[in-house]
């Protein structure tokens, strides 16, 4: 059993049929000594009488809000969440494992550039009783510092007859240099409690992975004199790290029919514009990477040929 | 990615397509390494990030972008000193901080240099013949080393008499690797600043 | 005590359908995963589903994905495993089994697949 | 398609020690715990050992399991005719958990 936060407390079982459970003892947080009685959530059914209560806690039915009275008066509360071990592996069934880029991802993080800023997300089917708290860190051993906000519902779909909600947190790395060379990951810790289960999820990665630039922006089009060619040009995101000449990005340019089944043809280039030939009803896509290191490429941005 | 190779243009900046073939060949180096040592722990997320530079060089410091010595996080500098006669500087007004970073650069590329050979020679007395460093790889290393033309003490090749441990080796290779894919991705930035300045 | 009692199995014809059984009684079957596994004749043990305590996800081996289907209903305490299209190489004893460190495993049903 | 690999036998005498190894990878036994079942003809599979040495109770002190990096092994010391019988090792792959991985199963025969 451990401490979550003042007065909640986490007991780890080896969850199996049958099993024997742990046996706590939860203390009255009073300097009174006799006339002291338990009870457990909303019950009134008194389950024991002293300073001290010991219990065997093998289900969800032995966790809760334990609290302490004295002559109709409340002393204290003791929150019990349980936190359950399947065969030697905790846990994940308030979160979706989204499986991707692999299996058993249930947290996916993004960086739009260097700055040590970040945006973490995750989903769940639980709609309600359902709390999040985010820790992080550079490194775990000698931990540096990176902040998070409060973790926020940030969207909602409905995927076949359930619900899905993703939630999402942002985190800033407290002293960041974009041009450092990672050498320790960033730790990601979210700690999950869904009525009187805890659960909790760690990711880790470097930065320089998880970079996403936004789209390339002011996507222009202008049509070269007597031919079917147009010179497409582009700018940087306003996100992307600075100076540009040492955060470079190369670009990706794609001209799409109107039908997904037509050809696509590509060029792959580091300047901000490129000569192509436009179809008609197609239209002309860019998507930017950094050049140096293959993260993801950005989403296009797009405009029509007409 | 299959991007066309761009050539430089005769008055560009000397060192940037070096640095360009630096970053391809290191990175196709890493992925075969990753394809071939499968079943050792390759991955980023898997060996443990060293480099064989700490404390001896201070490239990201020494190269940093005149707009991010303003942020206070990138500007915990070591003092280092070094030789300052570079090729890649020719025909520039350059500061005493560029010769300083193309120095350390060059010192960098020193100490792979060292460190691959080595690696290969063990690697070579392998009976599992398993993998070997691209002899593409330390080429571009060493056309670099020229184009940045810096004269500085030769260090020797560390020669090991103990029977080499093969599954530590390539342990060790892949870290190098990595270690080594990082800093190439500075360098071409570096360069890629230096030639638009 | 745990108990898993399984029922269901058979002989069938390539092609057709089963389906298979586990009462459980003894514990909260709500509140733990459950198993298949089955054994051809001879051979050793292969994993064929798994399913959540809830329902809400199922897993299958690439060997019977698509054609099984691994379901419980909390109320009643009991596993099922419906098994369509079936083949020769399902021909099996077929076990149910809890999920956890220590496991409880049903006495086994044997299906057989042929013409 | 086992990614867990036994030797398919094993023998011994009475009272000898008899050990079973179970070869996996990284993603299996190198990052999850290992279980053993012994298996009678025509019973079901019995739990012998759970986290990767963990003895339930009611299982002689005779087995023992054990585990190091990618491989685990079960030893059985002063193994005696009762003990014939196959015997399986499990596992998890990371990126398929739950999905049980077994071993190819081992027969232990007892000699004399």
């Known amino acids: 059993i451990w401490e979550l936060k003042k007065d909640v407390y986490v007991v780890e079982l080896d969850w199996y049929p049958d099993a024997p459970g742990e046996m706590v003892v939860l203390t009255c947080d009073t300097p009174e000594e006799d006339g002291i009685t338990w009870t457990l959530d909303q019950s009134s059914e008194v389950l024991g009488s002293g300073k001290t209560l010991t219990i065997q806690v093998k289900e969800f039915g032995d966790a809760g809000q334990y609290t302490c009275h004295k002559g109709g008066e409340v002393l204290s509360h003791s929150l019990l969440l349980l936190h359950k071990k399947e065969d030697g592996i905790w846990s994940t069934d308030i979160l979706k494992d989204q499986k991707e880029p692999k299996n058993k991802t249930f947290l996916r993080c993004e960086a739009k550039n260097y700055s040590g800023r970040f945006t973490c997300w995750w989903l769940t089917t639980i709609s309600t009783d359902l709390t999040f708290s985010v820790k992080s860190s550079r490194g775990s051993s000698d931990p540096q510092g990176v902040t998070c906000g409060a973790a926020t519902l940030s969207a909602e779909r409905v995927r076949g007859d359930n619900k899905e909600y993703e939630y999402s947190v942002e985190c800033q790395e407290d002293s960041a240099c974009p041009a450092a060379e990672e050498s320790l990951p960033i730790e990601v810790m979210v700690d999950a409690v869904h009525k009187l289960k805890y659960e909790n999820y760690t990711s880790s990665f470097f930065i320089r992975d998880i970079i996403k630039p936004d789209p390339p922006k002011n996507l222009q089009l202008k049509p070269l004199k007597n031919s079917r060619q147009v010179e497409v040009s582009w700018e940087y995101p306003d996100t992307w790290s600075t100076p540009h000449s040492y955060f470079s990005l190369t670009f990706c340019v794609q001209v799409q029919g109107k039908s997904k089944r037509e050809k696509k043809d590509r060029v792959f280039t580091d300047k901000t514009s490129a000569t192509v030939i436009c179809r008609k009803n197609a239209s002309i896509s860019v998507r930017a990477q950094d050049r140096y290191y293959s993260s993801s490429w950005s989403e296009w941005a797009s405009v029509p040929c007409s | 990615r299959n991007l066309p190779v761009a050539t430089p243009d005769p008055g560009m900046f000397p060192c940037l397509h070096h640095s360009q073939n630096l970053l391809r060949a290191v990175s196709n180096m890493l992925q075969k390494a990753r394809q071939t040592l499968e079943f050792y722990p390759c991955t980023s997320e898997e060996i443990d990030h060293e480099d064989i530079t700490k404390d001896k060089t201070s490239t990201v410091e020494a190269c940093l972008p005149l707009e991010l010595t303003k942020n206070e996080s990138c500007l915990n500098s070591r003092e280092t000193s070094f030789i300052t006669n570079g090729s890649c500087l020719a025909s520039r007004k350059t500061s005493f901080m560029m010769a300083l970073c193309l120095s350390s650069i060059y010192e960098d590329l020193k100490m792979y240099q060292v460190e691959f050979k080595t690696m290969n020679a063990k690697l070579l007395m392998d009976p599992k013949r398993q993998i070997f460093l691209d002899q593409n790889m330390l080429a571009v290393i060493d056309e670099l080393m020229q184009a940045l033309n810096f004269n500085s003490e030769t260090v020797p090749q560390k020669s090991s008499l103990e029977e080499p441990d093969f599954y530590k080796t390539k342990i060790k290779l892949c870290i190098l690797l990595h270690a080594f894919r990082i800093r190439a991705v500075t360098i071409d930035r570096v360069m890629s600043y230096l030639n638009a300045s | 005590q745990v108990q898993l009692v399984q029922s269901g199995g058979g002989v069938v014809q390539p092609g057709r359908s089963l389906r298979l059984s586990c009462a459980a009684s003894?514990?909260?079957?709500?509140?733990?995963?459950m198993h298949w596994v089955r054994q051809a004749p001879g051979k050793g043990l292969e994993w064929v589903a798994f399913i959540r305590y809830d329902g809400s996800n199922k897993y299958y081996a690439d060997s019977v994905k698509g054609r099984f289907t691994i379901s419980r209903d909390n109320s009643k305490n009991t596993l099922y495993l419906q098994m369509k299209s079936l083949r020769a190489e399902d021909t099996a004893v077929y076990y149910c089994k809890t999920h956890g460190s220590h496991d409880n495993w049903g006495q086994g049903t044997m299906v057989t697949v042929s013409s | 398609s086992y990614v867990l690999t036994q030797p398919p036998s094993v023998s011994g005498t009475p009272g000898q020690r008899v050990t079973i190894s179970c070869s996996g990878g990284r993603s299996n036994i190198g990052c999850n715990t290992v279980k053993w079942y012994q298996q009678l003809p025509g019973t079901a599979p019995k739990l012998l050992i759970y986290?990767?040495?963990q003895r339930p109770s009611g299982v002689p002190d005779r087995f023992s399991g054990s585990k190091s990096g990618t491989s685990a092994s079960l030893a059985i010391t002063g193994v005696q005719a009762e003990d014939e019988a196959d015997y399986y090792c499990q596992s998890y792959d990371r990126g398929t958990h739950p999905a049980l991985l077994f071993g190819t199963g081992t027969k232990v025969t007892v000699l004399g």
């Open positions: 003894g514990f909260t079957f709500s509140s733990y995963g």
């Open positions: 986290g990767n040495d």
